[in-house]
């Protein structure tokens, strides 16, 4: 049935970047400015996503695709194809409807995105905390208390934590 | 080629909630943004909202207490509700596939008419 | 909210003879790319709307080149060289650069 379709149906010969115009007894055209055709046999073009606002362009369209949007400095895509554009926030922060604010105590954000996060309870594990958490680190968790007693092997003490902001990106 | 239809319910009671479903054929929603606009009888186009596939969502501030739009990427489906509805909702309302997320409206549905009466 | 406004609002034509419709906005669609925001539609009599043009004026594929837009920033026309009797129906021009898009209140076209 395809194959004698496609026969019959002269639009079945546009490729992509045409479409069969009806208003040309169904000759292939060049699609529009600003507008694509991704696959052959088409009778419209689609017009191309424009990046506005906080989005910005980061592949043009062409006569065969559409055009794909990122996001402006300070804010990052949401969703499949980067469909919204959400502000950023400092690590040690989360995204309110009031803006960003700071992590609460015994919570941490490590980056620039995101929810705050509950510090890990190292005593779940049987372990114990070896650095302390901050608003933009989780906790360390080291060996259980018990592997810290008398006689025990002794243990390297950690490197100091690194100061907020000079984590590698 | 693409084609939208938009089904529900013809009359809604005043306060209860309008809920309309537009079906995508001829092509995958898994693209695009995907929008509400309605007209009410004798008057100009408005535009209610937009959901992309993955679910982000936009909305006209006149209408955002009461409208919400969802999408069903396995029905090729998206819908519209509207709460609280009065006589001023009823309109005919489209169905429409957006390129950018609030421009360009290239396939509409044939639209359907809810009237809103006790 | 971006405010459009057409004129005029009622427009009888007689066929064969050219027409045009005017759309200003209450502030410059014109994007840093040198893309203006701007679509026409017509909705003919019991049809949904169609789009004509877009970006100000690019004609939609598969639409008459009787139709063109032109224009730039807020200041915006449609024109059609040679009205048909199929033309008639309801124009409204709609601003794209910002959410919410908003429509013009339509100009009527009708043949004299």
């Known amino acids: 049935f395809e194959r004698t379709r496609s026969l019959q149906d002269p639009c079945s010969n546009c490729p992509a970047g045409t479409f069969c115009d009806n208003n040309r007894n169904q000759i292939c055209s060049p699609c529009p400015p600003n507008s694509f055709s991704s696959a052959g046999g088409q009778r419209t073009c689609d017009i191309c996503r424009q990046c506005k606002g906080v989005f910005r362009t980061r592949k043009e369209c062409s006569s065969t695709s559409n055009a794909e949007c990122d996001c402006t400095p300070g804010f990052h895509c949401l969703g499949a194809g980067c469909s919204m554009c959400e502000q950023d926030c400092k690590q040690g922060q989360e995204l309110t409807k009031k803006g960003c604010k700071d992590c609460c105590f015994g919570t941490f954000n490590d980056q620039k995105r995101g929810i705050c996060r509950p510090w890990t309870n190292c005593s779940l594990d049987g372990k114990s905390v070896l650095v302390n958490g901050t608003k933009e680190r989780d906790v360390v968790c080291g060996p259980s208390p018990a592997d810290l007693s008398p006689g025990a092997s002794s243990v390297t003490p950690p490197a100091p934590a690194r100061e907020p902001g000079h984590s590698p990106q | 080629q693409v084609q939208l239809q938009e089904s529900g319910p013809g009359l809604v009671k005043p306060s209860e909630t309008l809920s309309l479903t537009c079906t995508v054929s001829?092509?995958?929603?898994?693209?695009?943004?995907w929008s509400w606009i309605r007209q009410p009888p004798g008057k100009g186009l408005e535009w209610m909202g937009y959901?992309?596939?993955?679910?982000?969502?936009q909305y006209n501030p006149s209408l955002k207490s009461r409208v919400t739009i969802s999408v069903d990427t396995s029905k090729n489906q998206f819908s519209l509700k509207l709460s609280s509805v009065t006589a001023a909702d009823t309109a005919v309302y489209y169905c429409?596939?957006?390129?950018?997320?609030?421009?360009?409206?290239?396939?509409w549905g044939q639209g359907t008419l809810v009237t809103v009466s006790s | 909210e971006i405010v459009m406004t057409q004129s005029p609002l009622s427009l009888p034509v007689t066929p064969g003879e050219p027409a045009s419709i005017s759309c200003r906005s209450s502030?410059?669609?014109?994007?840093?790319?040198?893309?203006?925001?701007l679509d026409w539609y017509l909705q003919k009599p019991g049809q949904s709307p169609q789009l004509l043009i877009y970006?100000?004026?690019n004609r939609a594929s598969g639409v008459p080149d009787r139709f063109s837009g032109s224009g730039s920033g807020t200041d915006f026309t449609l024109k059609i060289s040679r009205v048909e009797a199929e033309d008639v129906g309801v124009y409204y021009c709609?601003?794209?650069?910002?959410?919410?898009?908003?429509f013009g209140q339509g100009t009527k076209l009708e043949i004299k």
């Open positions: 429409a596939r957006d390129q950018s997320g609030g421009g360009s409206f290239q396939h």
């Open positions: 502030q410059s669609l014109l994007y840093s790319n040198a893309y203006n925001h």
């Open positions: 959901i992309y596939y993955s679910g982000s969502t």
């Open positions: 709609m601003q794209a650069l910002q959410t919410p898009p908003t």
């Open positions: 970006a100000g004026s």
């Open positions: 001829g092509g995958s929603i898994s693209s695009y943004y």
